[in-house]
Interface confidence: medium
């Protein structure tokens, strides 16, 4: 019935966060017995997501208050039988619109979950959850759809012209014709021999009775054929039997007069001359998390929800699993990002779903001509002259080392270095002394620094 | 010295929960996952899930259908698989192991904890 | 899931003779088979990993060879203190899944 800020709880915040206009969705979920939360987050009864949704526009500085929630129905159709105890989750979605919202578009407000205890075909049940800072007002009530019936909706009644010993009204199941459907609790008031009702809060009559409560008979009535009431005198006290009279709209439908007849106004969800038939289509809005519905303009042709990645369901309701498929290879663990999946590797494994083992030389090649050496489980690259790195992609400073010897000095060249020697010396590393008397020149103690090896850098 | 040690012998009813725990010593807790396997009697080892310590990632074997969930608390240095709706046919020694995360699998297990289910 | 069909069941051997355990997968796992041992009262041991590299602190007696399907466990020179029940797990995706066990015995 409200959304809004809680009592007492500090500043009220408004559920547009005055971030201009905005929308709230309610997303119901059913879920079985106690809800278990960290293991099981399908709602396995079923879910459903609020479609009557009007715009709030707030202005800045205007005091937050509770925001009035529409009339429309959130309509949860439940597979198989009622199982009278569930767990009962409602998620507030805000979606801010306009141009400069800001921030994400949508929002996860509120949750609130809850055990519950209820039995098809009782009274609305109200009640207000409090979660954070904000407090939900709702009622929730469980109903079968005809023709099953009881309170777990698990026994099929279909109307029968054979007389059963089922009191007026109540009509005999089948196939246990000695069980008769239990009772709604009709309007106060509603004749018990005359009227019944399919829905709590409705009284509809029998044939040959009318009137609000079904207390009128119609066949005695003096004013069978006027369409207004006559002077006091003839007892005519109610209109007379129109098309609308008796209410022939099932399901909560309101009947209006069109030439001589009646058309139903049903609400969401009911469909039929009379909103006898209960059936979804796309107006709906059956499709949760960004499903596409395709098809159901009618509720003879079945609408079908395209689901985006991420979530599968008749209504796209329940997040698929995709870790479970186990993409990730050599042990990588998954995360399901729900826009994509990614692999967290195992170390010494890469790649999207980490299959390239980068211990393993047939994995990875090395780089700038290097070679791969593979030993004691585990790969390594012995890269060519001027390059270096794991995989041989740096170039590599060859006068880092400093090779050239007695105060040589060093030049790096694209085929790897040259020295300049020092006067009195000469060599690829300037490793010889020259004699001054021309003899052979002969290999001189090093000066300071070892003389370095002329190797390839690794 | 790396030490993975079990909680103690568990008897429980079907239907009923079962939290195991499994305390690391003698390495940095967080570096290294942490896998769950069982041995059912006269069975094959069959691997359960593993769970990254340092933000509790966790993959499962789908077999086990949600019923186990695997949890971390790094404060205590201990691991913990909790099976829910035990059947008989759960009836297991249930291990913890240790993975290296580099290339060897699990290279350190528990002692293992015994879980009998049984009406 | 990768089945791994473990052969033989049982295998008894001489003391310092060589034992010999096979491993099959159904599907080619690359190199990415690990063994272990398996002793009652002391905790399971990894023996050799990725197929054939040796775990630290495991006797050199032991060795892995194999890849893509078909992969062995040689013990070289059986010892006393190798009685044991020997496992092979394929650890190149998950779930990870392990053979049936050879039991190893003293002839």
């Known amino acids: 019935h409200s959304f809004g800020p809680g009592p007492g709880l500090g500043t009220p915040r408004s559920p547009c966060n005055a971030r201009g206009p905005c929308r709230l969705f309610f997303r119901v979920c059913l879920k079985p017995g106690v809800s278990q939360e960290a293991t099981e987050s399908l709602c396995a009864l079923g879910a459903a997501l609020s479609t009557s949704v009007p715009v709030y526009t707030e202005h800045p500085g205007e005091s937050a208050a509770a925001l009035p929630l529409p009339d429309g129905l959130v309509r949860v159709p439940f597979r198989d039988a009622w199982p009278g105890t569930f767990s009962l989750v409602i998620e507030t979605w805000r979606e801010q619109l306009g141009e400069h919202a800001g921030g994400p578009a949508w929002n996860l407000l509120a949750r609130v979950v809850g055990r519950r205890r209820l039995a098809a075909g009782g009274p609305w049940a109200r009640d207000v959850q409090r979660t954070g800072t904000w407090e939900l007002h709702f009622s929730y009530r469980a109903r079968c759809e005809p023709p099953a019936v009881g309170a777990a909706c698990a026994r099929l009644c279909r109307s029968r012209s054979a007389p059963s010993r089922c009191g007026p009204g109540l009509r005999p199941c089948t196939p246990f014709p000695d069980e008769c459907e239990a009772p709604s609790v009709c309007r106060p008031g509603c004749s018990p021999e005359h009227g019944y009702c399919e829905e709590p809060d409705e009284c509809r009559c029998l044939e040959g009775w009318t009137g609000p409560l079904c207390t009128v008979p119609v066949s005695t009535s003096s004013c069978l054929n006027s369409r207004v009431p006559g002077p006091a005198s003839t007892g005519c006290l109610l209109p007379g039997p129109g098309p609308c009279d008796g209410n022939p709209c099932a399901n909560g439908g309101s009947c209006s007069e069109t030439s001589g007849s009646f058309e139903c106004a049903c609400p969401r969800g009911f469909y039929g001359l009379r909103c006898e038939v209960s059936g979804v289509t796309c107006a709906d809005g059956p499709c949760f998390n960004g499903g596409l519905c395709v098809g159901g303009e009618d509720p003879d042709s079945a609408y079908v929800c395209h689901c985006p990645p991420g979530f599968q369901g008749s209504n796209c309701e329940k997040r698929v699993d995709r870790c479970s498929l186990q993409p990730c290879q050599n042990g990588g663990l998954c995360l399901d990002l729900g826009h994509a999946l990614r692999c967290r590797c195992r170390a010494g494994f890469a790649g999207p779903r980490c299959e390239h083992d980068l211990d393993d030389c047939a994995g990875r090649a090395c780089a700038n001509g290097g070679t791969c050496v593979e030993g004691g489980g585990s790969r390594r690259c012995s890269c060519a002259l001027g390059f270096g790195g794991r995989d041989c992609r740096e170039r590599a400073d060859p006068c880092a080392s400093r090779p050239c010897a007695h105060g040589g000095r060093c030049y790096a060249h694209f085929s790897g270095l040259v020295c300049a020697c020092a006067p009195g010396y000469m060599g690829v590393r300037c490793e010889f002394a020259v004699r001054p008397d021309g003899a052979d020149a002969v290999p001189a103690a090093p000066r300071g620094l070892r003389q370095a090896d002329p190797q390839r850098f690794l | 010295e790396v030490q993975l040690v079990q909680s103690g012998a568990e008897v429980k009813k079907p239907g009923a929960s079962v939290k195991v725990s499994c305390k690391a010593s003698g390495y940095t807790f967080t570096s290294y996952w942490m896998h769950w396997v069982r041995q059912a009697p006269g069975q094959r080892l069959e691997w359960m899930g593993v769970i990254d310590p340092s933000d509790s990632l966790a993959n499962y074997n789908q077999e086990f259908k949600g019923r186990v969930t695997l949890t971390v608390d790094t404060s205590a240095s201990t691991a913990y698989m909790e099976l829910s709706s035990l059947r008989s046919e759960d009836t297991a020694v249930y291990y913890c192991?240790?993975?290296?995360?580099?290339?060897?699998?699990?290279?350190?297990w528990g002692q293992g904890t015994t879980v009998t289910v049984s009406s | 899931d990768i089945v791994m069909t473990q052969s033989p069941d049982s295998l008894a051997v001489s003391l310092g003779e060589r034992a010999t355990i096979n491993c099959r997968a159904t599907?080619?796992?690359?190199?990415?088979l690990a063994w272990y041992q398996q002793k009652p009262g002391q905790t399971n041991k990894l023996l050799i990993f990725?197929?054939?590299t040796l775990q630290s602190g495991v006797p050199d007696r032991f060795s892995g060879s194999g890849s893509g399907t078909d992969f062995t466990l040689t013990i070289s020179s059986l010892q006393a203190e190798d009685v044991a029940v020997y496992y092979c797990?394929?650890?190149?995706?998950?779930?990870?899944?392990f053979g049936g066990g050879t039991k190893v015995e003293i002839k």
């Open positions: 599907k080619s796992i690359s190199k990415y």
């Open positions: 990725s197929g054939s």
């Open positions: 797990q394929q650890h190149h995706e998950y779930p990870y899944t």
């Open positions: 192991a240790r993975d290296s995360t580099v290339v060897a699998p699990m290279d350190y």
